[in-house]
C-alpha cells in the first residue's frame, strides 16, 4: 500500500525437526478479526494459501500442509506438526476486517547431526610427502542447518596453513532435506605427530542454543626414516649359561627397517652374521660361554638401500667350568685321613662348598675338605659345589665317592619273617664293604644280586617254604678280601593269634627286606660328619 511504513522484521520461531511449530498470529484486534484469517506460506517470494479461519473454524487448503495444520489457542495459533527442513520459510497470517493486515513469522528449523564419524587414513602418512596428505575424514550425518567443523590436534584447533594444513569440507543434501557434512583434513605431518591425538568437533545450533559433538580421538600412522639403531638384550643384568637370551635390534624409524645382527670373531677380527628369527631377534637358547662377544646390528632401508650401524654391545655369558675333584676315586683305611681338593674356572669369582651327599649338610666352605680318623660311616658321597654368589643359579657340582676299606657290614644281624608252608618266599639281604662284598645263601633257591652303589650289594632269594626250612631258618653270608659276616632270617609260621588286625599280610608273609637304615653293626662317629641314626 503506498505510503505504508516498511514491513517489520518477521517474528522468529525456532523448532527442531520432527516436533510441532506453534505459529501465533500476532495481529492486534485493531488490525483484524482473528476469527477471519488466511494463512500463507512464502517460498521463493511466492505466497501459497495453506489455511483459512472463518468464524473461528479452521480449514486446511489442499497441498503439502494439508495433513499437518490445526488451530489452537481459540484460533490465534496455527500448529504445524512433524516439522521438516523444507518447512524453513516465512508464514504469514492475514486478517480480513476491518483492514487487510498481515503478520509475518520466520520459521527456523534445527536438527542435531549424528555423532561425528572420524576415519583415519588406513595407509598412514609419510613425513617426507611433497604435499599435504589426507590424514582423516570427519562425517556428520543428518544435521540441519549445515554444522561447522573444527579439527583438533592435541586439544588445539587446527588452522589452515599454506602447504601444511588444508581442510576441505563438502556437504550433501539427503532426501529428507538434512545435510551430511564431510570434512577432509589434509596435512603434512612430522615425526612428532606419531603420538598426536586428532579429533573433529561439529558445532551446531538448536532452539536451546549452541551445541557441539566431538568424535573419538585417533592417532595417525606416521612413517619416518630410521635415524638411530641400537641393540637390546633380554634378560637385563648378569647372564649365565643355560639362560634364554634374546638380542633384539631396534630402530627409531617407522616402519622398522630390515635388520641383521653380527658377532665379532676375535680370531679373524671379522663380523659374522647371526641367524635371527622372523622378527630380527637373535635367540640364544641355551646360552653358552661361546656366545660371549661383541654384537652389532645393521639396519637396512630397503627402499633407499641406506644402512645404519648400531653401537657394538659386549655380551658376557657367565659360566662355571666342569668341576674337578682330586683324588677322583678316593679309597682309605679306617682311621686314616683324606684331603679332597676342588677346582673350577669361571668368568666371575667362585665360592666353593663341600656337602655330604646323603644329608646335604655343609661340611666346608672352601675348595679343600680335610677328613681325619676316618670311620666306615665316612664312606659314601661328597659333593663339591662351585658357585658364583653374584649370579643366583650359576653353579656346577661334582660328586666323589669315598670308599673305606673294611670287611662286610650287614644291614641286619637277624630278623623274623612270618610265612605259610608251601608259599614261595622272597628274601633279601644287604651288605656293604670295600672291596664290594658278594653274598651267598645257605639254602637252594633262585638268587639275584644287584649293586646299590660301589660298596653296597643287595641279594634277593626266592625259596619255597618247607618244614626243613622252618626248622633251620635261612642264612646269608657276605664276604670280601677283608672278611665275612652273616645275617640270619628266622621263619615263623603264621597262625590266627599271630595276625593282628592291622598286620600287612602281604608284606608280612612274603618278603623280608632290609633297609640300610636298620643297621645291626657297631657304630662310631667322626669329625665333620652328621651324628648317625640309632641303629641295630
Amino acid at each position: 500500500v503506498p505510503g505504508e511504513a516498511e514491513q517489520p522484521a518477521p517474528e522468529l520461531v525456532e523448532v527442531e525437526v520432527g516436533s510441532t511449530a506453534l505459529l501465533k498470529c500476532g495481529l492486534s484486534q485493531s488490525q483484524g478479526n482473528l476469527s477471519h484469517v488466511d494463512w500463507f506460506s512464502v517460498h521463493k517470494e511466492k505466497r501459497t494459501l495453506i489455511f483459512r479461519v472463518r468464524q473461528g473454524q479452521g480449514q486446511s487448503e489442499p497441498g503439502e500442509y494439508e495433513q499437518r495444520l490445526s488451530l489452537q489457542d481459540r484460533g490465534a495459533t496455527l500448529a504445524l506438526t512433524q516439522v521438516t527442513p523444507q518447512d524453513e520459510r516465512i508464514f504469514l497470517c492475514q486478517g480480513k476486517r476491518p483492514r487487510s493486515q498481515e503478520y509475518r513469522i520466520q520459521l527456523r528449523v534445527y536438527k542435531a547431526p549424528e555423532e561425528p564419524n572420524i576415519q583415519v587414513n588406513p595407509l598412514g602418512i609419510p613425513v617426507n610427502s611433497k604435499e599435504p596428505e589426507e590424514v582423516a575424514t570427519c562425517v556428520g550425518r543428518n544435521g540441519y542447518p549445515i554444522p561447522q567443523v573444527i579439527w583438533y590436534k592435541n586439544g588445539r584447533p587446527l588452522k589452515e596453513e599454506k602447504n601444511r594444513v588444508h581442510i576441505q569440507s563438502s556437504q550433501t543434501v539427503e532426501s529428507s532435506g538434512l545435510y551430511t557434512l564431510q570434512s577432509i583434513l589434509k596435512a603434512q605431518l612430522v615425526k612428532e605427530d606419531k603420538d598426536a591425538q586428532f579429533y573433529c568437533e561439529l558445532n551446531y545450533r538448536l532452539p536451546s542454543g549452541n551445541h557441539m559433538k566431538e568424535s573419538r580421538e585417533v592417532t595417525v600412522p606416521v612413517f619416518y626414516p630410521t635415524e638411530k639403531v641400537w641393540l637390546e638384550v633380554e634378560p637385563v643384568g648378569m647372564l649365565k649359561e643355560g639362560d634364554r637370551v634374546e638380542i633384539r635390534c631396534l630402530a627409531d624409524g617407522n616402519p622398522p627397517p630390515h635388520f641383521s645382527i653380527s658377532k665379532g670373531n676375535p680370531s679373524t677380527r671379522e663380523a659374522e652374521e647371526e641367524t635371527t628369527n622372523d622378527n630380527g631377534v637373535l635367540v640364544l637358547e641355551p646360552a653358552r660361554k661361546e656366545h660371549s662377544g661383541r654384537y652389532e646390528c645393521q639396519a637396512w632401508n630397503l627402499d633407499t638401500m641406506i644402512s645404519l650401524l648400531s653401537e657394538p654391545q659386549e655380551l658376557l655369558v657367565n659360566y662355571v667350568s666342569d668341576v674337578r675333584v682330586s683324588p677322583a676315586a678316593p679309597e682309605r683305611q679306617e682311621g686314616s685321613s683324606l684331603t679332597l681338593t676342588c677346582e673350577a674356572e669361571s668368568s666371575q669369582d667362585l665360592e666353593f662348598q663341600w656337602l655330604r651327599e646323603e644329608t646335604d649338610q655343609v661340611l666346608e666352605r672352601g675348595p679343600v675338605l680335610q677328613l681325619h680318623d676316618l670311620k666306615r660311616e665316612a664312606g659314601g658321597g661328597y659333593r663339591c659345589v662351585a658357585s658364583v654368589p653374584s649370579i643366583p643359579g650359576l653353579n656346577r657340582t661334582q660328586l666323589v665317592k669315598l670308599a673305606i676299606f673294611g670287611p662286610p657290614w650287614m644291614a641286619f644281624k637277624e630278623r623274623k619273617v612270618w610265612v605259610k608252608e608251601n608259599m614261595v618266599l622272597n628274601l633279601s639281604c644287604e651288605a656293604s664293604g670295600h672291596p664290594r662284598p658278594t653274598i651267598s645263601w645257605n639254602v637252594n633257591g633262585t638268587a639275584s644280586e644287584g649293586d646299590q652303589d660301589p660298596q653296597r650289594v643287595l641279594s634277593t632269594l626266592n625259596v619255597l617254604v618247607t618244614p626243613e626250612l622252618l626248622e633251620t631258618g635261612v642264612e646269608c653270608t657276605a664276604s670280601n678280601d677283608l672278611g665275612k659276616n652273616t645275617s640270619i632270617l628266622f621263619l615263623e609260621l603264621v597262625n590266627l593269634t599271630t595276625l593282628t588286625p592291622d598286620s600287612n599280610t602281604t608284606t608280612g608273609l612274603s618278603t623280608s627286606t632290609a633297609s640300610p637304615h636298620t643297621r645291626a653293626n657297631s657304630t662310631s662317629t667322626e669329625r665333620k660328619l652328621p651324628e648317625p641314626e640309632s641303629r641295630g
Epitope: 564419524n117 576415519q119 583415519v120 587414513n121 588406513p122 595407509l123 602418512i125 609419510p126 610427502s129 611433497k130 604435499e131 599435504p132 596428505e133 589426507e134 575424514t137 562425517v139 577432509i184 573419538r216 600412522p221
Partner: antibody, heavy 116, light 106 residues
Framework: QVTLKESGPVLVKPTETLTLTCTVS????????VSWVRQPPGKALEWIAA???????YYNSAFKSRLTISRDTSKSQVVLTMTNMDPVDTATYYC??????????WGQGTLVTVSS | DIQMTQSPSSLSASVGDRVTINCKGS??????LAWFQQKPGKVPKLLIY???SLQTGIPSRFSGSGSGTDFTLTISSLQPEDVATYYC????????FGGGTKVEIK
C-alpha cells in the same frame, strides 16, 4: 564422469616383470588416491598397492619387494610393476579410486595369465 | 594384519526374501567398513561405506549396520538382479577383504 581403465599384457612368463597402466578420467590424481587390487580366478579380492594424492606410495607387505607404483599426473596414469611373476600371480588386476579411504570407482579389470 | 571373516560363504534365497550377510573383523575397526557387490564376470561395485552409508545410486533395499568387529549387510527384499558375490572390506588399517558370500536365487 569418473572412469578408470587398466591396460597391459594378458600373458607373461614366469620370472618376467609385469607392467600395468591405469588411465583415469573425470578426476585428478592430485585429488584422489588410486589403488591396485587383484582377484585370482574364483578367489577373493586382494589389495596390492596404492599411490596417494600427494604422491606417497604404499604396498602390501606380502609383495613389497616385488612392487613399484608410480604416476604421471600429466597423462593421468598410474603404473604398477611387479617383478618375478609366478603362476600364482595369475589374476584379474583392477585399479580403483579412493574417496577418500574407501574405493568408489573401479576399472573394468585386466586378466593377466602367468604361464610358460 | 586385520582379517575379515564373512559368513555364510554362500546362500540361496527366494525373490522377496530378507537376506543378511555377516562380516567379522579380527579387531575393532570402528565403522571403517565397505560392502561391494560383484556380479559374475563384472567389476566390484560399492554398495555401502562407513559401515552404514548407502552409496549414491544404490537401491534402498540394501543397508549396512554394525560397528567395532561385527557388521551386517541386509537386502530387505531380494531381487533377481541381486544374484552376485558380496565382499566386505575394512579400511581401518591397510585394506583387507572378506572371503565373499555368493547369493543365489532358489
Amino acid at each position: 564422469q569418473v572412469t578408470l581403465k587398466e591396460s597391459g599384457p594378458v600373458l607373461v612368463k614366469p620370472t618376467e616383470t609385469l607392467t600395468l597402466t591405469c588411465t583415469v578420467s573425470g578426476f585428478s590424481l592430485t585429488s584422489n588416491a588410486v589403488s591396485w587390487v587383484r582377484q585370482p580366478p574364483g578367489k577373493a579380492l586382494e589389495w596390492i598397492a596404492a599411490i596417494s594424492s600427494g604422491g606417497s606410495t604404499y604396498y602390501n607387505s606380502a609383495f613389497k619387494s616385488r612392487l613399484t607404483i608410480s604416476r604421471d599426473t600429466s597423462k593421468s596414469q598410474v603404473v604398477l610393476t611387479m617383478t618375478n611373476m609366478d603362476p600364482v600371480d595369475t589374476a584379474t588386476y583392477y585399479c580403483a579410486r579412493h574417496r577418500p579411504f574407501y574405493f568408489d570407482y573401479w576399472g573394468q579389470g585386466t586378466l593377466v595369465t602367468v604361464s610358460s | 594384519d586385520i582379517q575379515m571373516t564373512q559368513s555364510p560363504s554362500s546362500l540361496s534365497a527366494s525373490v522377496g526374501d530378507r537376506v543378511t550377510i555377516n562380516c567379522k573383523g579380527s579387531q575393532n575397526i570402528y565403522k571403517s567398513l565397505a560392502w561391494f557387490q560383484q556380479k559374475p564376470g563384472k567389476v566390484p561395485k560399492l554398495l555401502i561405506y562407513d559401515a552404514n552409508s548407502l552409496q549414491t545410486g544404490i537401491p534402498s533395499r540394501f543397508s549396512g549396520s554394525g560397528s567395532g568387529t561385527d557388521f551386517t549387510l541386509t537386502i530387505s527384499s531380494l531381487q533377481p538382479e541381486d544374484v552376485a558375490t558380496y565382499y566386505c572390506q575394512q579400511y581401518y588399517s591397510g585394506y583387507t577383504f572378506g572371503g565373499g558370500t555368493k547369493v543365489e536365487i532358489k
